[in-house]
């Protein structure tokens, strides 16, 4: 695995610890809570930054609504149990023995239930729509610029491959941002659109996973983008399933 | 060249608490994880935790949670482990290792809990 | 955990003989495999690190193998001196784990 040889450091995850013993001498940098060595030339998975964070210390016109299978993650931080490749686990349990079913990006998609709850897969996000409001500016931004400097960022600051960046719009206040990516279009190396919204929802909240990098300063045509609140749905390859109780 | 040394053999009561040392040369203390094996006569090498000396960043096995503690004294590059409310399942030796390759060891040091 | 199996528990040898020591890991683990001599009373000495990497001062008799979950440590012409207890160790993720060991014993 990549990291920066000179200083042996992490550029893309901070909840790393790293140090000169990979193979052939290499540095080798290794999640905080796992211990999993991480590539650090791209992004590190969500689930393995939860286990560190965890360890560590409408209007809708041009907008889009939500369909009815959107989950929201309401459920907050856990301690996530990560595969070997750094995935969720299709199951999750806390140390009280309740279970339930996680999409690709960790969030609940089933009721909860007890240690004998099967997941029988993983089940793939494959459309994330971040809804963003922004504090309020002389004018409203430019539709064309603020649409090419967010795609700019999920390129340079994300690495991820601009045809997963489906769709920007907007409506003073409001922002929202589409990605999409199906199983089959992901390709080995590509980063995974859920990795990329988790650093994106990190960076908006002041708590950049970069290393030593600054805060995110988001401007378009020189005017701060600033944003005081943040709403991110997840659409399932495969909808949810909740019992309607839930849903009332 | 890179060196750990441990402090001597202990024999100690049930129920008392021990702490174990470790001192490093030879390499950057700070910059390499520092971990600890249990080996019972007889048994296997049993991995207790390790510690990064830079960071202060400890991890455990569950089994030695409550067990052992891991500290580090950078000043003098030092590795410690207390182990706490010792019974005769302590016994055995206890090594220190520079991780996660484990390429330096110890010598060892051998715990006897009695009474 | 990652459950590390070594097999067999005991080897026995003549000097002079080619042997192969056996270590499969619970999941993949890529190469983060390593393999340690032991002899009696002495610290574990480091012989192989990921899988197949040679170490300064231990002789080119030992050698490794493997990826994945199947992982082999080889001496191709078995002395005396490598009479010990053997034993492999997993540095994929915490907690690290050791193989319950392979006795060597010489005929």
């Known amino acids: 695995h990549t990291a920066a040889q000179d200083n042996c450091t992490c550029p893309t995850n901070k909840m790393t610890v790293c140090s000169p013993d990979g193979p052939g001498g290499r540095c080798q940098c290794r999640a905080l809570g796992s211990g999993m060595a991480v590539d650090c030339s791209t992004l590190t998975s969500k689930c393995l930054l939860l286990k560190a964070r965890m360890s560590a210390p409408k209007n809708a016109r041009t907008l889009v609504r939500p369909s009815e299978h959107a989950l929201v993650d309401n459920d907050g931080l856990y301690d996530p149990d990560c595969d070997p490749e750094g995935r969720f686990k299709a199951r999750q349990c806390n140390q009280t023995s309740v279970c339930w079913c996680v999409n690709s990006v960790g969030v609940r998609r089933t009721d909860k239930g007890d240690l004998s709850l099967r997941c029988d897969e993983l089940v793939r996000t494959h459309h994330i729509l971040i809804d963003l409001r922004h504090r309020p500016t002389a004018g409203a931004f430019n539709h064309s610029d603020l649409d090419a400097e967010l795609r700019r960022l999920f390129r340079e600051r994300y690495r991820l491959h601009p045809k997963f960046v489906a769709a920007v719009h907007y409506e003073q206040p409001t922002i929202q941002i589409e990605l999409r990516q199906n199983t089959s279009q992901k390709a080995a190396g590509d980063v995974d659109i859920g990795d990329a919204a988790y650093y994106f929802e990190r960076d908006i909240k002041g708590e950049s996973l970069f290393q030593g990098r600054g805060g995110l300063d988001l401007r378009v045509r020189g005017e701060p983008l600033q944003v005081e609140r943040t709403l991110i749905y997840y659409l399932d390859e495969i909808p949810p399933k909740f019992s309607m109780k839930r849903l009332t | 060249q890179v060196q750990l040394q441990q402090s001597g053999a202990e024999l100690v009561r049930p129920g008392t608490s021990v702490k174990i040392s470790c001192k490093a040369s030879?390499?950057?203390?700070?910059?390499?994880?520092l971990g600890w094996v249990k080996q019972r006569p007889g048994h296997g090498l049993e991995w207790i935790g390790n510690?990064?000396?830079?960071?202060?960043?400890?991890n455990y096995n569950e089994k030695f949670k409550g067990k052992a503690i891991l500290t580090a004294d950078t000043s003098s590059s030092t590795a410690y482990m207390q182990l706490s409310s010792l019974t005769s399942e302590d016994s055995g030796v206890y090594f220190c290792?520079?991780?996660?390759?484990?390429?330096?060891w110890g010598q060892g040091t051998t715990l006897t809990v009695s009474s | 955990d990652i459950l590390l199996t070594q097999s067999p528990a005991i080897l026995s040898v003549s000097p002079g003989e080619r042997v192969s020591f056996s270590c499969r890991a619970s999941?993949?683990?890529?190469?983060?495999i390593h393999w340690y001599q032991q002899r009696t009373n002495g610290f574990p000495r480091l012989l192989i690190k990921?899988?197949?990497e040679s170490i300064s001062g231990i002789p080119s008799r030992f050698s490794g193998s493997g990826s994945g979950t199947d992982f082999t440590l080889s001496i191709n012409s078995v002395e005396s001196e490598d009479i010990a207890d053997y034993y492999c160790?997993?540095?994929?993720?915490?907690?690290?784990?050791f193989g319950s060991g392979t006795k060597l014993e010489i005929k």
């Open positions: 290792a520079r991780e996660g390759v484990m390429d330096y």
């Open positions: 030879g390499y950057t203390f700070t910059n390499y994880w």
């Open positions: 510690i990064f000396p830079g960071g202060g960043y400890t």
């Open positions: 999941q993949n683990i890529g190469t983060s």
């Open positions: 990921y899988a197949s």
């Open positions: 160790q997993q540095s994929y993720s915490w907690p690290f784990t």
